[in-house]
């Protein structure tokens, strides 16, 4: 499916706890509101114009796997995040990894397997 402007749909789903997008082409992920109540977001086998700069205050689990496009990681603001799976995206990540990349100090699980070049230049400060 190709979803060009689906913010109206997202706004209707602001209070669901889990949300999954599979095999979707989507350009406007940064239109997600910080206030959305999602606790678990799954983006699998989707196509993005750029890495989605997610900003979601309630999100605890993010599964972002096997996606195409947006090959450079850019920071997200997910203050409640505990679980992050970024595997199999062909991502390059210059300067992994610090609290400031994810906007959280709560991270317990991080999977960066099967990606591109991951350059480690921080010692997981704030993610201990």
């Amino acid at each position: 499916y190709y979803l060009d402007d689906i913010i109206d749909l997202f706004n209707c789903l602001t209070n669901v706890s889990s949300f999954s997008l599979v095999s979707v082409t989507i350009e406007r992920v940064k239109d997600f509101s910080y206030n959305f109540g999602w606790q678990h977001l799954e983006l699998v086998n989707c196509k993005f114009g750029q890495f989605p700069t997610l900003k979601l205050k309630s999100l605890k689990r993010l599964t972002f796997t096997s996606n195409k496009g947006g090959n450079a990681f850019s920071e997200v603001d997910l203050p409640s995040l505990e679980f992050l799976d970024l595997s199999r995206n062909g991502l390059s990540f210059k300067g992994c990894c610090s609290q400031s990349d994810f906007g959280t100090t709560s991270l317990k699980y991080l999977d960066l397997s099967f990606n591109g070049v991951i350059t480690m230049s921080s010692n997981f400060l704030g993610l201990e």
Epitope: D31, K57, V76, K94, G95, S98, S100, G103, L125
Partner: antibody, heavy 118, light 107 residues
Framework: QVQLQESGPGLVKPSDTLSLTCAVS?????????WHWIRQPPGKGLEWMGY???????DFNPSLKTRITISRDTSKNQFSLKLSSVTAVDTAVYYC???????????WGQGTLVTVSS | EIVLTQSPDFQSVTPKEKVTITCRAS??????LHWYQQKPDQSPKLLIK???HAISGVPSRFSGSGSGTDFTLTINSLEAEDAATYYC?????????FGGGTKVEIK
């Protein structure tokens, strides 16, 4: 507590290069966040100039891209601004700031006034 | 670039009055809008993030609302110490941009 402190000459001649340094205490700049320069001409609003990410990546306001350089010295925990070919319109209070993940600025230096005049 | 237009430019208000400052974006920015207070000869201070989320330590009389293109900063029951210039800033896209500012004066 993170603190930022700008320093540099308060007077620069037209066509010269403006050079400022921001000393950071309370957080190692090589371990996280991005570190920004923002300026404010006297009596006017704020203009974002550019930043250096903790990885060393830099990005700038397109309006300044041909004249601006931002670098860092992690051993001194400081980052620097250079702005070339300055004119009177570059007269401003220059602030350094730390941006959080959500593209906002919780931490600012106190600012330093730079006047461009012969 | 995203242009932020603030209104009014200037407001003269008596203590305990309610102040409303608006910020309009040239395109939709979801809720990626932040507010700052700047007192004379001081650096800006973050008041509100993401349109409506108060920063720790900021008095509860400051509140924000809005989404998309239209945003509001409200100061309920203005106090003398609130005399300052207030700026909005969008974090939706680079280059990051600020509104032109609203100066609030105490009558």
């Amino acid at each position: 507590q993170v603190q930022l402190q700008e320093s540099g000459p308060g007077l620069v001649k037209p066509s010269d290069t403006l050079s400022l340094t921001c000393a950071v205490s309370g957080y190692p700049i090589r371990f996280g966040y991005s570190w920004h320069w923002i300026r404010q001409p006297p009596g006017k609003g704020l203009e974002w100039m550019g930043y250096i990410h903790y990885s060393g990546y830099t990005d700038f306001n397109p309006s300044l891209k041909t004249r601006i350089t931002i670098s860092r010295d992690t051993s001194k925990n400081q980052f620097s601004l250079k702005l070339s070919s300055v004119t009177a319109v570059d007269t401003a209070v220059y602030y350094c700031a730390r941006k959080d993940s959500g593209n906002y600025f919780p931490y600012w230096g106190q600012g330093t006034l730079v006047t461009v005049s012969s | 670039e995203i242009v932020l237009t603030q209104s009014p430019d200037f407001q003269s208000v008596t203590p305990k009055e309610k102040v409303t400052i608006t910020c309009r974006a040239s395109q939709s920015i979801s809720d990626h809008l932040h507010w700052y207070q700047q007192k004379p000869d001081q650096s800006p201070k973050l008041l509100i993030k993401y349109a409506s989320h108060a920063i720790s330590g900021v008095p509860s009389r400051f509140s924000g609302s809005g989404s998309g293109t239209d945003f509001t900063l409200t100061i309920n029951s203005l106090e003398a110490e609130d005399a300052a210039t207030y700026y909005c800033q969008q974090g939706y896209d680079f280059p990051l941009t600020f509104g032109g500012g609203t100066k609030v004066e105490i009558k």
